[in-house]
């Protein structure tokens, strides 16, 4: 069954700046990735970025830089200042649409004992499976 993993990291240099990395482990051709915060996309969450493999990338504040890392993973850097900046317990969600297979979403937040600058494991909890 396809899996989506989400990794949230606080930057050591800017303590209110976050990097979100998401990846898809499954079959099909990724046709769209949606990154949101505050909950799942379409269920109270606010869209931060939409990445399309051909039509390009759209992002909204406080997203600073969204990019493809590989054909099946993305990263997003968030600005750390202003009223709309994330806090330590913010939930980030990534939804991958894979043609012609389906779409799957997983969410994650900063690990409770997160040491800024130290990266979490490549596929940290939580991983949400579509079982």
């Amino acid at each position: 069954t396809p899996e989506v993993w989400v990794q949230v990291r606080m930057e050591a240099t800017e303590l209110s700046s976050f990097t979100i990395r998401c990846g898809f482990l499954g079959s099909g051709s990724i046709s769209l990735v949606t990154v949101s915060w505050g909950g799942p996309n379409g269920a109270g969450g606010t869209t931060l970025a939409v990445l399309h493999p051909e039509r390009g990338i759209r992002q909204w504040a406080p997203a600073r830089q969204a990019r493809w890392e590989t054909q099946s993973s993305i990263s997003l850097i968030l600005e750390g200042s202003g009223a709309s900046s994330p806090c330590a317990n913010t939930t980030f969600c990534c939804k991958f649409a894979s043609f012609p297979e389906g779409s799957w979403e997983a969410c994650g937040s900063l690990p409770p004992s997160s040491d800024p600058g130290l990266s979490a494991p490549p596929t940290p909890a939580p991983i949400l499976r579509a079982d």
Epitope: T1, S27, G28, F99, P100, G102, S103, W104, A130
Partner: antibody
Amino acid sequence: EVQLQQSGPVLVKPGASVKMSCKASGNTFNGYYVNWVKQSHGKSLEWIGLIDPSNGGTNYNQKFKDKATLTVDKSSTTAYMEFNSLTSEDSSVYYCAGGTVYWGQGTTLTVSS
Amino acid sequence: DIQMTQSPSSLSASLGERVSLTCRASQDIGNNLNWLQQEPDGTIKRLIYATSSLDSGVPKRFSGSRSGSDYSLTISSLESEDFVDYYCLQYASSPVTFGGGTKLEIK
């Protein structure tokens, strides 16, 4: 694992319409799109289109855009394909599939007067 | 639409033999190719996804590979239940298209 149960064989007259179903066991499609595929007797497979059960979004093969209508009933976790203006060319076996991995057993459609 | 040319359309082979089936794509599809198996009663099962990844529960005698625009399904040692139909499908772009199929027959 998603198990898909398709409706039984149907015999209809030319010009009529038919609606076949594809029921997901366990009350969930588990994120998978429902694809519909046509297999004419002794021939290869043709992709008709897909529907996203989560929001009803569709993607049709242009060849079948005016022939097929894909819908889903989330409450019963059942996908439907309606075929209209039937001719003998539509006599085939029709499969639904969860993505490309979980396949229904097929529904045989016979169009005959 | 992307055309998938599958060969041979039928193949006679013996138990224990190694066979390869091929699909050629009319344009670049990357690794976006799956292989399906269809039994005489119509049951369809996916064997390989993304050119070379084996689906769970599929015997290790099945493998997939690519050379340029040619994609192969290889069965290393044929068993009796392998003498059925096989199809490739590409999903690099919509619409999904299938190869014409290969009927594997026992010699």
